[in-house]
Interface confidence: low
Amino acid sequence: VPGEAEQPAPELVEVEVGSTALLKCGLSQSQGNLSHVDWFSVHKEKRTLIFRVRQGQGQSEPGEYEQRLSLQDRGATLALTQVTPQDERIFLCQGKRPRSQEYRIQLRVYKAPEEPNIQVNPLGIPVNSKEPEEVATCVGRNGYPIPQVIWYKNGRPLKEEKNRVHIQSSQTVESSGLYTLQSILKAQLVKEDKDAQFYCELNYRLPSGNHMKESREVTVPVFYPTEKVWLEVEPVGMLKEGDRVEIRCLADGNPPPHFSISKQNPSTREAEEETTNDNGVLVLEPARKEHSGRYECQGLDLDTMISLLSEPQELLVNYVSDVRVSPAAPERQEGSSLTLTCEAESSQDLEFQWLREETGQVLERGPVLQLHDLKREAGGGYRCVASVPSIPGLNRTQLVNVAIFGPPWMAFKERKVWVKENMVLNLSCEASGHPRPTISWNVNGTASEQDQDPQRVLSTLNVLVTPELLETGVECTASNDLGKNTSILFLELVNLTTLTPDSNTTTGLSTSTASPHTRANSTSTERKLPEPESRG
């Protein structure tokens, strides 16, 4: 075209993919009449007429731009919609009158790439490799033009370094015209890189300026040889029988070697391999004193067959032996004295306590409990607790039952029971003594006995309420070789003015079930009488 060399540089119009480019024809009135303009696209130096303006009216030419062009700004501006990367070219407008002049516009197209996707080499990298190995791959999809990639390690940009760092980038053009960038970071890593954080950054331009997107941070598996193996015991601190103890082998290499844990046989002094779980952990559960001893760990590198041995570790499982109490089954008369002695062995200093079983009250701190002037109430359970004060929870106990010779002793002397005629009553009577008493009833019925403890017995009786029974009441008698004792249960008819028939309240210590003869059962609860009772 004549005079093209003198033409000024084209005006630059920048636009993002998918948006609308406004191509303003920059011809001045002197250069041409904007009501009579031809628009061309220039691709590979070939001009193609794409739009005509005649008397201010626009008309698209058939072809790739036919559907995307329209006239704006009273004919001075050509709008190109749905811009694609292929639209990055020169557009020119040519005025026909008074003489043929043209104005060129360079359209630049941009598209931000997607978030970079980083994939670490899942196979990992050995530290002793001869040349850089693939660390990670970074992919930035659908950007335009091609973004730049920068790799970072621990926040610092990585530069190409001969035989140490190599960055291999390639790109593909999608059918959309957008670029997908793939960058592979290759590096020689050292042991300290096992915790290193790698990421990639895409730098790209938009009409608004320069931008960047960062990938997530990744760490790469780094393989390095084991230099040291050691044992670790959990929990830390003093161990006791019953604990769950885990002995594990640890190594400073990756992958860790194949571990085996051995315990020194105290008699042969030979190391004997222990059975570990799938994770190579020796679990002692529950730990026993026999587990005490010297443990060591062997780490075998299955590639090199190099074996490393840990320093031995002495394991002490603290214990308290079975507790022995003497005398084991003491029997005493009322008013006498009794000395109870407790013995046990332990790996640590022991502390002894004597407790009353029924109340939990501490009676003595020490192995010897002296009981003087024994009363009947002193009969029952005494528990010796042997504990290691420096190891909370390490203790053993032994219960001894002290029997005080004496005649039966009744839980109650008298009791009132509210009843209805023709009901089946469930009555109970409790007595204690040594030897343990037996209980009999003064009426016919179904009786059963339960031993509550070595000196105490509970008897229950099911009986039908009759007029005769209401008259006589019910007696239970407890007897042993030393004597007998009686409790009386007074039966009283429920009065409608005092109680509703369904409430069936009774008084006394235990529970009575009162059921109407040939009717459904109902329960009556006995409550203790308010006035003091003799328990003779």
Epitope: V236, G237, M238, Q313, P389, S390
Partner: antibody, heavy 119, light 108 residues
Framework: QVQLVESGGGLVQPGGSLRLSCAAS????????MSWVRQAPGKGLEWVSA????????YYADSVKGRFTISRDNSKNTLYLQMNSLRAEDTAVYYC????????????WGQGTLVTVSS | SELTQDPAVSVALGQTVRITCQGD??????ASWYQQKPGQAPVLVVF???NRPSGIPDRFSGSSSGNTASLTITGAQAEDEADYYC????????????FGGGTKLTVL
């Protein structure tokens, strides 16, 4: 024989930071819990922090919780105490200490390093 | 949790002195006892029920009852003049530790 040598003490302004180190020798370092204990001038001993042999468990006195961090490097037989947000009342001789075999109490002490917090 | 010690105790040369330490934690744990001389690091003298590290004279002994631990020096020597500290785990059952306030022993 057991040796514990502290370093890193010195003068620091309130709000500042300091890192104490303790080089240990003469015993299997990784098998023992270690502690830091301090002693303000003319005052008694105050337990500061402890760490298990593996470094997996750490314990702190209420007075330093959130400000001090105990750590260890078993490969270097070294115990550390990172002290941040220092206050005047942190001024003391700081002792590195080794736990007894039983655990729960101390059997060997270093000679201490003086930390002075003053503007 | 706290361990309480008398601030100062004195003893005549060759006599017996008892230094006490009170605290809830002593119901569950034994106290360990440390001797500290001016300008020096503390030294363990008694631990556990009544154990002495090697090199500690047998005039030092320990005992415990309830929530009180005691350090007894039988036949105190001039070189025993020092500060004595008791030490125990915290009564909360955690791995926290605690020291007593210290007792200044003067040998007259």
């Amino acid at each position: 024989q057991v040796q514990l040598v502290e370093s890193g003490g010195g003068l620091v302004q309130p709000g500042g930071s300091l890192r104490l180190s303790c080089a240990a020798s003469g015993f299997t370092f990784s098998s023992y819990a270690m502690s830091w204990v301090r002693q303000a001038p003319g005052k008694g001993l105050e337990w500061v922090s402890a760490i298990s042999g593996s470094g997996g468990s750490t314990y702190y006195a209420d007075s330093v919780k959130g400000r001090f961090t105990i750590s260890r490097d078993n490969s270097k037989n070294t115990l550390y105490l990172q002290m941040n947000s220092l206050r005047a009342e942190d001024t003391a001789v700081y002792y590195c200490a080794k736990d007894h075999d039983y655990g729960g109490f101390i059997d060997y002490w270093g000679q201490g390093t003086l930390v002075t917090v003053s503007s | 949790s706290e361990l309480t010690q008398d601030p100062a105790v004195s003893v005549a040369l060759g006599q017996t002195v008892r230094i006490t330490c009170q605290g809830d934690s002593l119901r569950s744990y034994y106290a360990s006892w440390y001797q500290q001389k001016p300008g020096q690091a503390p030294v363990l003298v008694v631990f556990g029920k009544n154990n002495r590290p090697s090199g500690i004279p047998d005039r030092f002994s320990g005992s415990s009852s309830g929530n009180t631990a005691s350090l007894t020096i039988t036949g105190a020597q001039a070189e025993d003049e020092a500060d004595y500290y008791c030490h125990s785990r915290d009564s909360s059952g955690t791995h926290l530790r605690v020291f007593g306030g210290g007792t200044k022993l003067t040998v007259l």
